[in-house]
Interface confidence: medium
């Protein structure tokens, strides 16, 4: 984050940004930036694998929900979108693309279909869905 | 926008940002930044006047919808929230807090109640509502 203090000292007061304001990012052009994470909603429908590939091609991953506080903008998302959560049949757990396990109490998992992938829906709900079904999707890029 | 080129030259290549990435803002801390506009969703319910006052106290205004392209993140907003659109009885038009008139084809206005204020809902819909009814609200700050 480019804090106001840093920018003001850097530019010798030429950039007048209130101390409570800050820059967010960096993010890919025209993505949403929130609490230094980048998000983009894609409204062309793809299956889970194609959605994952699309995010990867943009140096991002499918949405990972890791914090209700840091990601509270997700509360108000309308409709259903692929996220990066997949079912691991061998141990029955749900895990993210990066291999981390879904933390308890983060998502309410709802069995909508028999499947191994999950759609994100408002208020931190995850809907189980067949991975080959086309849906819109959310890509996410965590800034360093 | 702090472009990658500018930042790279400023910091002598220490900050490695892809050329397609950029910073967004500045925005108030923890607000959503998108296409260099700042947004925040407030989930305490207030009437229109209180909502307006809350936004103003944060150096912002209630949501103004001015472009479907620049504000396409609003397509996916769930629920109903006060925006800065009010009915002007003298000429029957709807205008924003800044005095500008609602452009045609930006919002589909829907008769929900008799009133002089409007709630924003997903897919660029505006719902007529009595200004004294408490609702959640969206504040917006346009960056220069």
């Amino acid at each position: 984050i480019w804090s106001a203090v840093f920018l003001n000292s850097l530019f010798n007061q030429e950039v007048q940004i209130p101390l409570t304001e800050s820059y967010c990012g960096p993010c890919p052009k025209n993505w949403i930036c929130y609490k230094n994470n980048c998000y983009q909603f894609f409204n062309e429908s793809k299956n889970w694998y194609e959605s994952q590939a699309s995010c990867m091609s943009q140096n991002a991953s499918l949405l990972k929900v890791y914090s209700k506080e840091d990601q509270d903008l997700l509360k108000l998302v309308k409709s259903y979108h692929w996220m990066g959560l997949v079912h691991i049949p061998t141990n029955g757990s749900w895990q993210w693309e990066d291999g981390s396990i879904l933390s308890p109490n983060l998502l309410t998992i709802i069995e909508m279909q028999k499947g191994d992938c999950a759609l994100y829906a408002s208020s931190f709900k995850g809907y189980i869905e067949n991975c080959s079904i086309p849906n819109t999707y959310i890509c996410m890029q965590r800034t360093v | 926008i702090w472009s990658a080129v500018f930042l790279n030259s400023l910091f002598n290549q220490e900050v490695q940002i892809p050329l397609t990435e950029s910073y967004c803002g500045p925005c108030p801390k923890n607000w959503i930044c998108y296409k260099n506009n700042c947004y925040q969703f407030f989930n305490e319910s207030k009437n229109w006047y209180e909502s307006q006052a809350s936004c103003m106290s944060q150096n912002a205004s209630l949501l103004k919808v001015y472009s479907k392209e620049d504000q396409d993140l609003l397509k996916l907003v769930k629920s109903y929230h006060w925006m800065g659109l009010v009915h002007i009885p003298t000429n029957g038009s709807w205008q924003w807090e800044d005095g500008s008139i609602l452009s045609p084809n930006l919002l589909t206005i829907i008769e929900m109640q008799k009133g002089d204020c409007a709630l924003y809902a997903s897919s660029f819909k505006g719902y007529i509502e009595n200004c004294s009814i408490p609702n959640t609200y969206i504040c917006m700050q346009r960056t220069v």
């Epitope: - | 009885p89 003298t90 709807w94 829907i110 008769e111 929900m112 109640q113 008799k114 009133g115």
Partner: antibody, heavy 121, light 107 residues
Framework: QVQLQQSGTEVKKPGASVKVSCKAS????????LTWIRQAPGQGLEWMGW????????NYSLKFQGRVTMTADTFTNTAYMELRSLRSDDTAVYYC??????????????WGQGTLVTVSS | AIRMTQSPSSLSASVGDRVTITCRAS??????LGWYQQKPGKAPKLLIF???NLESGVPSRFSGSRFGTDFTLTISSLQPEDFATYYC?????????FGQGTKLEIK
């Protein structure tokens, strides 16, 4: 083009109920309210109330409160007005009209052709 | 309820005449008033909304104006098809109320 097509003439006995329908076409039904207005023979127009088709919420004139029910079926794009405990002075042509509040759209810019309800013993 | 007092209740005029019909509201109603034309056996037709706005497709000889709580419908040059009954309607608050009507007849 916008059309509101109402159901046909009704003859009812005092104390009975009548349900008039109004089928909308040519526009997005849920965007506009739907109002009911009546006109007794040789008399002026009387506003009965309107329903927000979007959320099904009605606003009735106090005169008809308790006797009238306005509903809207968004699957068939049809609005209904039911009037109960009919009296002879309910004999009138009943109109549906597009619009509910007049706060954005011109109020009552399209009307049904009217349904004559005669209450007679 | 807001009372809308419409005058005159009837009016005889000739083709080409300028005609004025007035509605007075019993309290302030902003610009929340419309004018409607009704011919025998037909549904009313919207002419003017929000006091002075001409509905699309309505001839420009019709106009509306407001002065305080007095609202006026003016027909600048009467045409044969204008002979009908005219009503005002307030939609400022519930219950919406119509004026009692003005019957415009051929002299």
């Amino acid at each position: 083009q916008v059309q509101l097509q109402q159901s046909g003439t009704e003859v009812k006995k005092p104390g009975a109920s009548v349900k008039v329908s109004c089928k909308a076409s040519g526009y997005t039904f849920t965007t506009y309210g739907l109002t009911w207005i009546r006109q007794a023979p040789g008399q002026g127009l009387e506003w009965m109330g309107w329903i927000s088709v979007f959320n099904g919420s009605p606003n009735y004139s106090l005169k008809f409160q308790g006797r009238v029910t306005m509903t809207a079926d968004t699957f068939t794009n049809t609005a209904y007005m039911e009037l109960r405990s009919l009296r002879s002075d309910d004999t009138a042509v009943y109109y549906c009209a597009r619009g509910g509040t007049g706060d954005y759209y011109p109020l009552f810019d399209y009307w049904g052709q009217g349904t004559l309800v005669t209450v007679s013993s | 309820a807001i009372r809308m007092t419409q005058s005159p209740s009837s009016l005889s005029a000739s083709v080409g005449d300028r005609v004025t019909i007035t509605c007075r509201a019993s309290q302030g109603i902003r610009n929340d008033l419309g004018w409607y034309q009704q011919k025998p056996g037909k549904a009313p037709k919207l002419l003017i909304f929000a006091a002075s706005n001409l509905e699309s497709g309505v001839p420009s000889r019709f106009s509306g104006s407001r002065f305080g709580t007095d609202f006026t419908l003016t027909i600048s040059s009467l045409q044969p098809e204008d002979f009908a009954t005219y009503y005002c309607l307030q939609d400022y608050n519930y219950p919406y109320t119509f004026g009692q009507g003005t019957k415009l007849e051929i002299k």
